[in-house]
Interface confidence: low
């Protein structure tokens, strides 16, 4: 960052999107600002308009190509600059040499579905979205189940330390409404973080049969 009150954070989704957030104490809300991306060794460059997300922070997405195109690799460096308009010219407010595969945040898993549900168990599957083939199987997942009367924050985390796009939830209560979420993280990257949580999947366990427990 150009000064101590500015924070500029970006993540690569491993395919064709870099999402950035810039926060600046005391910055003017009506200033027009952009993120400029200049890869060190590629023919293209890209710009996105920073839009306010709070009183002192702005965000934008650099769309590098079609969603599943592999636009960057582990040896790419992208110089990212925040440029804000000052009268007739642009002023550089922040800069970073961005290493895409050290700053990964994948898209949230999609296509959650109940494969099989019983009274005490539920088998759920999902798919990862726009994840690079470079990861091969080097991904991990976290999942959580929302029980009645609890909040998501109270839900215990279940960790899957391998690329496993399904889970069998056990010890559930019969005839009960639950919600389920999952997120994904590559093992690669010093500053890599978890994806957003998936959209919740609502499901209901089967009622217990009269006179017996299945």
């Amino acid at each position: 960052a150009v000064n101590g009150t500015s924070r500029f954070t970006c993540f690569y989704n491993s395919r064709a999107n870099i999402s950035c957030v810039w926060s600046q104490d005391g910055a003017l809300q009506d200033t027009s600002c952009q993120v400029h991306a200049w890869p060190d060794r590629r023919r293209w460059n890209q710009t996105c308009e920073l839009l306010p997300v709070s009183q002192a922070s702005w965000a934008c997405n650099l769309i590098l190509g079609t969603p599943d195109s592999q636009k960057l690799t582990a040896v790419d460096i992208v110089t990212l600059r925040v440029m804000c308009r000052e009268g007739v010219r642009w002023r550089m407010m922040a800069i970073q040499d961005f290493k895409p595969f050290e700053n990964l945040r994948l898209m949230a898993p999609i296509s959650l579905q109940v494969v099989h549900v019983e009274t005490h168990r539920c088998n759920i599957s999902w798919k990862i979205s726009q994840a690079s083939h470079y990861f091969e199987r080097h991904l991990e997942f976290e999942a959580r189940t929302l029980s009645p009367g609890h909040t998501w924050e109270e839900a215990p985390l279940m960790t899957l330390k391998q690329k496993q796009e399904w889970i069998c939830l056990e010890t559930l209560t019969p005839d009960t409404q639950y919600e389920f979420q999952v997120r994904v993280k590559p093992l690669q990257g010093e500053f890599t973080t978890w994806s957003p949580w998936s959209q919740p999947l609502a499901f209901r366990t089967k009622p217990a049969a009269l006179g017996k427990d299945t």
């Epitope: 060190d40 590629r42 582990a74 040896v75 460096i77 110089t79």
Partner: antibody, heavy 119, light 106 residues
């Protein structure tokens, strides 16, 4: 025309330091990365490190404890400093820049500067 | 580090001969580069991204390969091709070069 001009080579005592300069013309060091490569007499090429356009660096792990690459954007010049020199650091040191296209290698090289480490 | 092994280390051929140099990487690489270095001169880029000819390079030079095995060819050796040729990978850091192939005229 893109040009790179190294300077600062010469005789250095074992245990001493060297500071080389790479003056760039025809492009700005705020827009392109500059790499350093060396070649010992009669030997092959060895990549040492790079300073990226925004100012961050990557080093060959074999040299990370004694190597610093920096730059002065106002002078459009990149600097290479290596400490604790030994005889095996005797080499021609080159600065180099990749071209403009997608994955196009070291298209531009300086003429090299000879560093001799000897007492 | 990825080790690059060039073969042969030296060769002698006649003007007009077809010359082939191979470069074996210790693990798979995505992009291969080839340089020519004449005595006392800086290296010169000949081939980038495995098979693309650098600007101003004669068409008698070519490159091919994938994975761990790459090939550099001079289709018709000329007197000015006397030099040492190096391969280089740019898939992981540190960037590494082959040990070089010295080409001489018989």
């Amino acid at each position: 025309e893109v040009q790179l001009l190294e300077s600062g080579g010469g005789l250095v005592q074992p245990g001493g330091s060297l500071r080389l300069s790479c003056a760039a013309s025809g492009f700005t060091v705020t827009s392109y990365a500059v790499h350093w490569v060396r070649q010992a007499p009669g030997k092959g090429l060895e990549w040492l490190g790079v300073i990226w356009s925004g100012g961050s660096t990557d080093y060959n792990a074999a040299f990370i404890s004694r190597l610093t690459i920096s730059k002065d954007n106002s002078k459009n010049t990149v600097y290479f400093q290596m400490n604790s020199l030994r005889a095996e650091d005797t080499a021609v040191y080159y600065c180099a820049r990749a071209g403009d296209a997608n994955y196009d290698g070291f298209a531009y090289w300086g003429q090299g500067t000879l560093v001799t480490v000897s007492s | 580090d990825i080790q690059m092994t060039q073969s042969p280390s030296s060769l002698s051929a006649s003007v007009g001969d077809r010359v082939t140099i191979t470069c074996q990487a210790s693990s798979s690489v995505s992009f291969m580069y080839w340089y020519q270095q004449r005595p006392g001169k800086a290296p010169r880029l000949l081939i980038y991204d495995t098979s693309n000819l650098a600007s101003g390079v004669p068409s008698r030079f070519s490159g091919s390969g994938s994975g761990t095995s790459y090939t550099f060819t001079i289709s018709s050796l000329q007197p000015e091709d006397i030099a040492t040729y190096y391969c280089q990978q740019w898939s992981t850091y540190p960037l590494t070069f082959g040990q070089g192939t010295k080409v001489e005229i018989k």
